[in-house]
Amino acid sequence: RQQWELQGDRRCQSQLERANLRPCEQHLMQKIQRDEDSYGRDPYSPSQDPYSPSPYDRRGAGSSQHQERCCNELNEFENNQRCMCEALQQIMENQSDRLQGRQQEQQFKRELRNLPQQCGLRAPQRCDLEVESGGRDRY
């Protein structure tokens, strides 16, 4: 069993290295930004129509494109729940220093947990997405 786990871990590691999780990160950041804009909550209220075109996050098409590419990547982890969890943890880790507020962090986590389901995949049962609050000091 230990040998199998070791092989499984190695397989997961190489899957993670091969995967391009950026589309997932882009999709989630656009989603939480758009939600914040459309509800007009602190810290920013919409100064334009939240769905008007902009070079960045208000491209509805861009976002769904990111989601599609994200789901294709996550699909690779469908048969390994623990590896799926590690992929989600990696996404959280990569974006944690962009989230300098508790609400933003919690919202990102919520959307991240829902991501497999949005892609029509099984969500890992237990998956700890905790990071140090406010992200890592990497500089």
Epitope: R22, E25, Q26, L28, M29, Q30, Q33, D42, P43, Y44, S54, P55, Y56, D57, H66, N94, Q95, R98, L99, Q100, G101, R102, Q103, Q104, E132, S133, G134, G135, R136, D137, Y139
Partner: antibody, heavy 118, light 111 residues
């Protein structure tokens, strides 16, 4: 209404220490990263330090690393900047600012003047 | 460290006319999540700075729509479509990709 009020500034000799405070009201203080930014007389803005909402992560500009320490007391809605080994070039108005949650400096205090002079 | 360079450093303007300020960073400010971590701030005479634009192109709440931000990577621009007398002050760009760094500022004054 958001209010950030800095205090603790004054005249201090080179090599000495000073502690600045920033009292926050009208905001969810313990939900956001907080920053210190300074402005030397007649000069531009210089980011100094930041601290994450739980106080776990601290970030510093190279110019103050090892001399300044940022901290916060969420139970008192107060941000601090402990400044040691002060130099003449630390003379500036020090502002505290609240992060938007996405790394922008959304709310600013009025500032407190620190003068380092012998 | 990322270095921010603004131009011009001084900008005399005529009310009603457009104005633009340029900001260049020593490295790309695009994060892997697709956002440009570049803000614009205005410090009016005798006041604290205020946020105008965040993430390169989004106007902060309450900022008049005559202000707009554009650009990506290392080159960014703040435009004022029609300058008003109350727009005078020093404009700063700031990168928030790696910690935080301000540009040296652009002083906008009425001709």
């Amino acid at each position: 209404q958001v209010q950030l009020v800095e205090s603790g500034g004054g005249v201090v000799q080179p090599g000495r220490s000073l502690r600045l405070s920033c009292a926050a009201s009208g905001i969810a203080f313990n939900d956001y990263t907080m920053h210190w930014v300074r402005q030397a007389p007649g000069k531009g803005l210089e980011w100094v330090a930041a601290i994450s909402y739980g106080g776990t992560n601290k970030y510093y500009a190279d110019s103050v690393k090892g001399r300044f320490t940022i901290s916060r007391d969420n139970s008192k809605n107060t941000l601090y900047l402990q400044m040691n080994s002060l130099r003449a070039e630390d003379t500036a108005v020090y502002y505290c600012a609240r992060d938007s949650g996405y790394r922008s400096l959304l709310h600013w205090g009025q500032g407190t003047l620190v003068t380092v002079s012998s | 460290d990322i270095v921010m360079t603004q131009s011009p450093l001084s900008l005399p303007v005529t009310p009603g006319e457009p104005a633009s300020i340029s900001c260049r960073s020593s490295q790309s400010l695009v994060h892997r999540n697709g956002y440009n971590y570049l803000d614009w701030y205005l410090q009016k005479p005798g006041q604290s700075p205020q946020l105008l634009i965040y993430m390169a192109s989004k106007r902060a709440s309450g900022v008049p729509d005559r202000f707009s931000g554009s650009g990506s990577g290392t080159d960014f621009t703040l435009k004022i479509s029609r300058v008003e007398a109350e727009d005078v002050g020093v404009y700063y760009c700031m990168q928030a990709l790696q910690t935080w760094t301000f540009g040296q500022g652009t002083k906008v004054e009425i001709k």
